[in-house]
Interface confidence: medium
């Protein structure tokens, strides 16, 4: 044992940090970190802030240990936010707005632009900002399946809350399907769970982006936080690089 060389953990740590720093810089196509002087003045763009806030709020509620990622997934993913098609779009006219459900449609061309191939998608989350909720609500999420049918995906019991909160549904499989087929617009439905003992089957929860009669300036902010799909995918060039390095091995 005396012949064993002691490991300088500090050095290992520094090298590891350098490696990660290098990966981040290459991902950003930068040779070195930008200096403070290069940081643009003024507030962050609304879209960046909204994405940060929704992620921060979700992470705050999570305490489970993350699963170890396979080597291919260790490297940076590209994260894209695709907003729901606005509610004044004609697609919504085909679906009778009811007190029981809300509908959320997405433009698949925007999804394909973000993720060109289904295999590149590692995770897709549907994120909704729920507003104050006075009573408990059991909700169910459905995927638009064919002309007049909906496929059940999952359910959630929402506890009463006096402040806004982000809800997140894992819809990876559904988005992969959408990327594989040729549809132009695909959608989800959020409905109140129907049960014999519930007070009524009205969707009590108020989801940001669906409330009408808002002042113009508030409507813009409201629209920024309307439901969206958060896509995490391996960039095409990174996937190709991984593929070729596997062949070399």
């Amino acid at each position: 044992l005396s012949t064993c060389k002691t490991i300088d953990m500090e050095l290992v740590k520094r090298k590891r940090i350098e490696a990660i720093r290098g990966q981040i810089l290459s991902k950003l196509r930068l040779a070195s970190p930008p200096s403070q002087g290069e940081v643009p003045p003024g507030p962050l763009p609304e879209a960046v802030l909204a994405l940060y806030n929704s992620t921060r709020d979700r992470v705050a509620g999570e305490s489970a240990e993350p699963e170890p990622e396979p080597e291919a997934d260790y490297y940076a993913k590209e994260v894209t936010r695709v907003l729901m098609v606005e509610t004044h779009n004609e697609i919504y006219d085909k679906f009778k707005q009811s007190t029981h459900s809300i509908y959320m449609f997405f433009n698949t061309s925007e999804l394909r632009e973000a993720v060109p191939e289904p295999v590149l998608l590692s995770r897709a989350e549907l994120r909704l900002l729920r507003l104050k909720l006075k009573v408990e609500q059991h909700v169910e999420l459905y995927q638009k399946y064919s002309n007049n049918s909906w496929r059940y995906l999952s359910n959630r019991l929402l506890a009463p809350s006096d402040s806004p909160e982000w809800l997140s549904f894992d819809v990876t499989g559904v988005v992969r399907q959408w990327l594989s087929r040729g549809g132009e617009i695909e959608g989800f439905r959020l409905s109140a769970h129907c049960s014999c003992d519930s007070r009524d089957n009205t969707l009590q929860v108020d989801i940001n982006g669906f409330t009408t009669g808002r002042r113009g300036d508030l409507a813009t902010i409201h629209g920024m936080n309307r439901p969206f799909l958060l896509l995490m995918a391996t960039p095409l060039e990174r996937a190709q690089h991984l593929q070729s390095s596997r062949h070399r091995r």
């Epitope: 509620g61 909720l133 006075k134 009573v135 408990e136 506890a159 009463p160 006096d162 007070r199």
Partner: antibody
Framework: VEESGGRLVTPGTPLTLTCTVS????????MNWVRQAPGKGLEWIGY?????TTYHANWARGRFTISKTSTTVDLKMTSLTTEDTATYFC????????????????WGPGTLVTVSS | AFELTQTPSSVEAAVGGTVTIKCQAS??????LAWYQQRPGQPPKLLIY???TLASGVPSRFKGSGSGTDFTLTISDLECADAATYFC??????????FGGGTKVEIK
């Protein structure tokens, strides 16, 4: 369930009360804070759900904040006035059914907060 | 604003007798009402929830009834240990969680 942190403070002083639980998990039960002024009735302040979601009484919103760790529930109070002098109770929601976050089956002995100049 | 009115504020009864306490809500709360007993110097104790369901370990001498806006707690075969203040509580939704003013029960 046991409350701590109650003491004599001057008006305007912030104060945090802590409720420590054992024998059950905060990931399974909602917790409530209720107060009782000397010789008066009970007043619900708010609750925190298993997920960390909170709901406060209208009068308490903005001045009282409930948060939690794995074994404790905190009540943070700001801008205290003499009207806030009371025994503060921490109480567990029954968990009998999902609707009953606010039906309280296990109470702490309470901690006394006195606000006086 | 939502209000819960409890009557009477105090009542006196003999051992073995019966006491009736009323609780009225300013709007319908279905059966989302609970009753608590608080003895001097102690925290409250849950007696009844869902207007009429007895909590675990509570004797059947305690009976809750009512729905909508009018509720009643009846204590029969009164014992000395029943001397306490009783509170009703509404929990229909987040904005209507609250307690009645309380009824002090004294045993002669």
């Amino acid at each position: 369930v046991e409350e701590s942190g109650g003491r004599l403070v001057t008006p305007g002083t912030p104060l945090t009360l802590t409720c420590t639980v054992s024998g059950f998990s905060l990931s399974s039960y909602a917790m409530n804070w209720v107060r009782q002024a000397p010789g008066k009735g009970l007043e619900w302040i708010g609750y925190i759900y298993t997920s960390g979601t909170t709901y406060h009484a209208n009068w308490a919103r903005g001045r009282f904040t409930i948060s939690k760790t794995s074994t404790t529930v905190d009540l943070k109070m700001t801008s205290l006035t003499t009207e806030d002098t009371a025994t503060y109770f921490c109480a567990r929601g029954t968990g009998i059914s999902d609707y009953y976050y606010w039906v309280m089956d296990l109470w702490g002995p309470g901690t006394l907060v006195t606000v006086s100049s | 604003a939502f209000e819960l009115t409890q009557t009477p504020s105090s009542v006196e009864a003999a051992v073995g007798g019966t006491v009736t306490i009323k609780c009225q809500a300013s709007q319908s709360i279905s059966t989302y009402l609970a009753w608590y007993q608080q003895r001097p110097g102690q925290p409250p104790k849950l007696l009844i929830y869902k207007a009429s369901t007895l909590a675990s370990g509570v004797p059947s001498r305690f009976k809750g009834s009512g729905s909508g806006t009018d509720f009643t707690l009846t204590i029969s075969d009164l014992e000395c240990a029943d001397a306490a203040t009783y509170f009703c509580q509404s929990y229909c939704d987040g904005d209507s969680v609250g307690f009645g003013g309380g009824t002090k029960v004294e045993i002669k």
